[in-house]
């Protein structure tokens, strides 16, 4: 394989490394209150935390990036914590004919990795 | 649609926002010199730069993240610049039976976005 095994234990201490965290947001926060009806409050899972060397590497590219960041930190950024997958959610919104239920596939993160 | 159109012009000035940049790396840099034979030097495209509000948003989640980062910067990180696609590369490496050519699909970035 082109890379070492990604590391899953956080060397920085509990809760410091890339993980999923729930953030509550209202439709007003999102600027959606004019077209989304319900729910007015969303539980949004987001990816937060640091990506130390080889922690939850998304792929070979991320492993390389981590290594080159160690060698050239000014030139190559460290990997960062982004969604690896999403959980679909349903929103109710206004339509010309009334109210509709619609699925959004890329709104709430389900898992995170370092890319 | 659940989000405003992602912005493609960089408000921070030329070269400051998320873009593809080529980094030269040797097999020694990557720690691969013991098993990869050729090429000895790789042109690695990587994603670098900042992700100001709505710049090259990967999806709805990234748009939300940008907005919530503006409201709660201590709790929600800004989107960051990661690969949106990859270019396959071929490496020649040692095997038990000699030498083999192998394609790696996730080694070199081809495009970038803010996730």
């Amino acid at each position: 394989s082109a890379h070492a095994h990604p590391r899953d234990s956080c060397p920085l201490g509990p809760g410091r490394c890339c993980h999923l965290e729930t953030v509550q947001a209202t439709l007003e926060d999102l600027g959606w209150s004019d077209w989304v009806l319900s729910p007015r409050q969303l539980q949004l899972s987001m990816c937060v935390g640091e990506c130390p060397h080889l922690y939850r590497s998304a792929n070979t590219h991320a492993q390389i990036k981590a290594r080159l960041h160690g060698l050239q930190p000014d030139k190559v950024p460290a990997p960062c914590c982004v969604p690896s997958s999403y959980t679909p959610v349903v929103l109710m919104h206004r339509t010309d004919s009334g109210v509709s239920l619609q699925t959004y596939d890329d709104l709430v993160a389900r898992g995170c990795h370092c890319a | 649609s659940a989000h405003a159109h992602p912005r493609d012009s960089c408000p921070l000035g030329p070269g400051r926002c998320c873009h593809l940049e080529t980094v030269q790396a040797t097999l020694e840099d990557l720690g691969w010199s013991d098993w990869v034979l050729s090429p000895r030097q790789l042109q690695l495209s990587m994603c670098v730069g900042e992700c100001p509000h709505l710049y090259r948003s990967a999806n709805t989640h990234a748009q939300i993240k940008a907005r919530l980062h503006g409201l709660q910067p201590d709790k929600v990180p800004a989107p960051c610049c990661v690969p949106s696609s990859y270019t396959p590369v071929v490496l020649m490496h040692r095997t038990d039976s000699g030498v083999s050519l192998q394609t790696y699909d996730d080694l070199v970035a081809r495009g970038c976005h803010c996730a």
């Epitope: 009806l37 319900s38 729910p39 679909p88 349903v90 109710m92 109210v99 239920l101 | -």
Partner: antibody
């Protein structure tokens, strides 16, 4: 805890109207919509409609269109369902239920209100 | 409207049995399916949402699976308190619709 408390049982004559209330507590009333679902004796569940507690937008089942009106009073966190021109086949237990939420869940139900239509 | 067809309409089982109830949608509903348990004289109780997510406080012997048009509720080891009627419900689009129900009875 989150709960929906409905008004008491009603007995009505054919042609009359009934108004059932549903008082919400334990959550922000305007963050969700309220569904009304009914169940005739010995039968399954029938969705009657939905109202957005924040805006008052509604979506009614086709077969009840024109006879049903759903409203909310945000000052008291109460939803109402009025059904007019009652018939004997409207005899049922009427439930209010919160949702759908972001995962299409209708998660909290009222205890039900028995409405009997009889001459 | 999306029709929800549940089967069987009733099932006789013993404590400890594994019970499987199926629900079929007349058109694709992604994973927007919920399962409810209802006991006589009581309101329905949410067991499973989004086809496979267990509602908080519901025992892990209940599980849901499926997506698109075919869905399953499984009770891995039937307990005395599980004898009830079970309903599936779609919330992919209005009007929200329910299956006809499956009564789980004591054998």
């Amino acid at each position: 805890q989150v709960q929906l408390v409905q008004s008491g049982a009603e007995v009505k004559k054919p042609g009359a109207s009934v108004k059932v209330s549903c008082k919400a507590s334990g959550y922000t009333f305007t963050s969700y919509g309220i569904n009304w679902v009914r169940q005739a004796p010995g039968q399954g569940l029938e969705w009657m409609g939905w109202i957005d507690a924040y805006s008052g937008s509604t979506n009614y089942a086709q077969k009840l269109q024109g006879r049903v009106t759903m409203t909310t009073d945000t000052s008291t966190s109460t939803a109402y369902m009025e059904l007019r021109s009652l018939r004997s086949d409207d005899t049922a237990v009427y439930y209010c239920a919160r949702g759908p939420g972001q995962y299409a869940d209708v998660d909290v139900w009222g205890q039900g209100t028995m409405v009997t239509v009889s001459s | 409207d999306i029709q929800m067809t549940q089967s069987p309409s009733s099932v006789s089982a013993s404590v400890g049995d594994r019970v499987t109830i199926t629900c079929r949608a007349s058109q694709g509903i992604s994973s927007w399916l919920a399962w409810y348990q209802q006991k006589p004289g009581k309101a329905p109780k949410l067991l499973i949402y989004a086809a496979s997510s267990l509602q908080s406080g519901v025992p892990s012997r209940f599980s849901g699976s499926g997506s698109g048009t075919d869905f399953t509720l499984t009770i891995s080891s039937l307990q005395p308190e599980d004898f009830a009627t079970y309903y599936c419900q779609q919330a992919n689009s209005f009007p929200i619709t329910f299956g006809g129900g499956t009564k789980v009875e004591i054998k």
